[in-house]
């Protein structure tokens, strides 16, 4: 059956032979209606990439550099299955390219000019492409030929496989630049030995190199890693201090109509029958015909790449930056310390309008990028298409797990001028009901619920976390008879109450009328029994404070709060009747952009923040008539975080624990991708 066939692309006679053997052995173990293998032979990996894009083949396994080529237009391929190394219990699908230095040296990443460098080899990922790609714009001009520019940047190097005649400085630390183990400074161990012997000041290797060469922790403690933010960390903190995270070996397929489920079904069956130590007659991860045919011999198995993970996310911002710099050779005209404009991520078109207005008023210091969901915005910040946005705590958690950092906190209670330097305790997550109802926290089963959005703090993480510990399962859509929780599956009962309009029904953005704090309260007013919101929501939308038709006649006293002890209290008493304290919303950014984002935002709020009194004739950053566009409307200022500059420290141990517990109920495709 052609639609059940996976056309594997082979790049040599030996690979084609192994592919045929793979095909025949899979036929013998799979049912006739199961997936099958067909073999397509091409001259190179690049030809395979083109063949898959043209629907002449379906899959091929590629190194990271080729995954980058595969992702570029017009190929548009995506990673679907990753080889893993190490054990099944602790599978390694990535390695980290690092810059190792001796602890007793005192320079940072931005002070490498004039130092001596040790590389694994010319054109290799961790030893050359990544470090030189990231340093590319600091190299002296002309940057071509690249080897000459590198030779003029460092005061001496060992770059195995370089041309020692044309570029003697690249072979200064290893005469001849031998391209095999005859050169004592060749490859990973060699580059590390070059540093250890004192020949070089920095070695560009992979994170495991230092552990493979120094079994003793006391010896390892004599070394440190250089981080991209110009700090240093210990060698075991490579996950937080690396030049790039590099995928090892990856199966790619078309982004649309790519048969990824079929490819996974095939490879999953293949590893069951022919994986490590499974079969004598055919081995997936070795071959009598040669090394690394179809798959790496060192692989231990396959893992399915999460569907949300596109090539940009898979390769990572640092890796793509390095490779793009090397390939395209473009740099800003004068690399300065000046901050470039910050690209704000706006959610759907209401936020985009406000962002555009901000952009016009900021004299071009703010630019705007749009996405349809918060998770899509976070992904755009991760891959460099956007720089920053302000997030509810639930999404600060997801952003943090995806490598972003909190930059400034929204403050709601502290009056100026102390606001900017005050760390507030947070706001209260509350459950609001109509005063006329007889609901309590203990009899919510079967009622109609209104939520700000799935994954948000007051509207979801806190109430559902509490509910989970009561009911011990994740079927929240069965607990409530119906509800509106934007971001739920469209056919779920938790989308039934949403108002839309139609194509946007239950979407987690302002196009859904019941989205956000105000939307969830409106849902309660018009259809629901309980709304999970922040403690300020009722006062902010009653007594004529919200001029919209549905809200203008509402009275605060017609609503009450549910307390966890089964009692109810006035909306004026949230301190004595709340579900939990929630961390304030916070601005997040990539680490490399955090300082610029902070500087710019502090400047912008001085011009457009809460000191502006007349928002009818001036642009106001924290104003959107109860819609909470870009920032919460009740923001007084954006405040410095001081030492709360990681998502764990910012959110606090208790909240992180609560959200981590809820992860078993997670519907976040982005979180799944970021924790892959």
């Amino acid at each position: 059956v052609p639609e059940k066939s996976v056309r594997w692309c082979a790049v040599s006679e030996h690979e084609a032979t192994k592919c045929q053997s793979f095909r025949d052995h899979m036929k013998s173990v799979l049912p006739s209606n199961g997936p099958s293998v067909a073999c397509v032979k091409k001259a190179s990996h690049l030809d395979c990439i083109r063949a898959i894009a043209a629907n002449e083949a379906d899959a091929v396994t590629l190194d990271a550099g080729l995954v980058y080529d595969a992702y570029l237009a017009p190929n548009n391929l995506k990673p679907v299955v990753a080889e893993f190394y190490g054990s099944k219990e602790d599978p390694q699908t990535f390695y980290y390219a690092v810059a190792v230095v001796k602890k007793d040296s005192d320079f940072q990443m931005n002070q490498l000019r004039g130092r001596k460098s040790c590389h694994t080899g010319l054109g290799r990922s961790a030893g050359w492409n990544i470090p030189i790609g990231l340093l590319y714009c600091d190299l002296p001009e002309p940057r071509k030929p690249l080897e000459k520019a590198v030779a003029n940047f460092f005061s001496g190097s060992c770059v195995p496989c370089a041309d020692g005649t044309d570029f003697p400085q690249l072979c200064q630390l290893c005469p001849g630049c031998g391209c095999s183990t005859l050169n004592q400074y060749f490859s990973y161990s060699g580059a590390f030995k070059c540093l250890k012997d004192g020949a070089g000041d920095v070695a560009f290797v992979k994170h495991s190199t230092i552990f493979e060469n120094l079994a003793n922790k006391a010896d390892r403690d004599q070394y440190e890693l250089l981080c991209l933010d110009n700090t240093r960390k210990s060698v075991d903190e490579y996950k937080d201090c690396h030049l790039a995270r590099v995928p090892s070996h990856t199966v790619v397929a078309r982004s649309v109509g790519g048969k990824e489920d079929l490819i996974w079904e095939l490879l999953n069956q293949a590893q069951e029958h022919f994986g490590k130590d499974k079969s004598k007659e055919f081995q997936l991860f070795s071959s009598p015909h040669g090394k690394d045919l179809l798959f790496k011999d060192s692989a231990h198995g396959f893992l399915k790449v999460p569907p949300r993970m596109d090539a940009k996310m898979y390769l990572g911002y640092e890796y793509i930056t390095a490779i793009r710099n090397l390939r395209e050779g473009t740099c800003p005209e004068a690399p300065t310390d000046e901050c470039k404009p910050v690209k704000w991520c706006a959610l759907s078109h209401h936020e985009r309008l406000k962002c555009d207005e901000w952009s016009v008023n900021s004299a071009g210091k703010i630019e705007c990028e749009s996405a349809e969901t918060t998770e899509d915005c976070i992904a755009k910040i991760m891959n460099g298409e956007a720089d920053a946005m302000s997030l509810d705590g639930g999404f600060v958690y997801i952003a943090g797990m995806c490598g972003l950092v909190p930059v400034l906190a929204e403050n709601y209670n502290t009056p100026n001028p102390n606001c900017e330097n005050t760390a507030e305790e947070g706001y209260f997550a509350v459950a609001v009901v109509k005063s006329s109802s007889d609901l309590t926290w203990d009899n919510l089963k079967g009622k109609k619920s209104c939520h700000t959005a799935v994954g948000r703090t007051a509207g979801w993480n806190i109430p559902m976390g509490l509910l989970y510990s009561k009911i011990n399962h994740c079927r929240f859509d069965e607990f409530f008879s119906e509800g509106c929780a934007p971001g739920s599956e469209k056919n779920s009962s938790l989308c039934k109450l949403c108002m839309g309009p139609s194509p946007n029904l239950c979407e987690p953005n302002n196009k859904e009328g019941y989205y956000g704090y105000t939307g969830a309260f409106r849902c309660l007013v018009e259809k629901g029994d309980v709304a999970f919101v922040k403690h300020q929501t009722v006062p902010q939308n009653t007594g004529g404070k919200n001029p919209d038709a549905w809200a203008k006649n509402l009275k605060e006293e017609d609503y009450e709060l549910l307390c966890l002890d089964g009692s109810r209290k006035s909306v004026q008493e949230p301190a004595n009747c709340h579900l939990a304290r929630a961390p304030n919303h916070a601005v997040v950014a990539r680490k490399d952009k955090a300082d610029c984002v902070q500087t710019l935002l502090l400047d912008q709020q001085r011009m457009f923040g809460s000191s502006v009194t007349d928002c009818s004739s001036n642009f106001c950053l924290f104003e959107s008539k109860t819609k909470d566009l870009l920032f919460r409307d009740d923001t007084v200022c954006l405040a410095k975080l001081h030492d709360r500059n990681t998502y764990e420290k910012y959110l606090g141990e208790e909240y992180v624990k609560a959200v981590t517990n809820l992860r078993k109920c997670s519907t976040s495709p982005l979180l799944e991708a970021c924790t892959f």
Partner: nanobody, 117 residues
């Protein structure tokens, strides 16, 4: 809310010029920001140019150096002078006052600009 009515569009050859006007039904003197957007078939509506009450301007990269936005508060009118027009400038053009901080989708009829030989 205040009505905004666009005019001045039409068919023009590549390299030609047009001047769009947008007249407001109420005073624009105290409006913080006004802007021109455009929407080509099958595309998202995009910001072309914006102007603040104080006269600061911002332009999309694709129109910089060719288009000029201005406002005449006495006449309650926003203008867009478009020179060196290109086929890719073909779109429906809209003006907005950002619904004065409400950010609602209050768009007028817009005005068609077609650049073709």
């Amino acid at each position: 809310h205040v009505q905004l009515v666009e005019s001045g569009g039409g068919l023009v050859q590549p390299g030609g010029s047009l001047r769009l006007s947008c007249v407001a039904s109420g005073s624009i003197a105290s409006v913080a920001t006004m802007a021109w957007y455009r929407q080509a078939p099958g595309q998202q509506r995009e910001l072309v140019a914006g102007i603040t009450r104080g006269g600061s301007t911002k332009y999309a990269d694709s129109v910089k150096g060719r288009f000029t936005i201005s406002r005449d508060n006495a006449k309650n009118t926003l203008y867009l002078q478009m020179n060196s027009l290109k086929p890719e400038d073909t779109a429906v053009y809209y003006c907005t006052d950002y619904s004065r901080g409400y950010y609602q989708d209050y768009w007028g009829q817009g005005i068609q600009v077609t650049v073709s030989s």
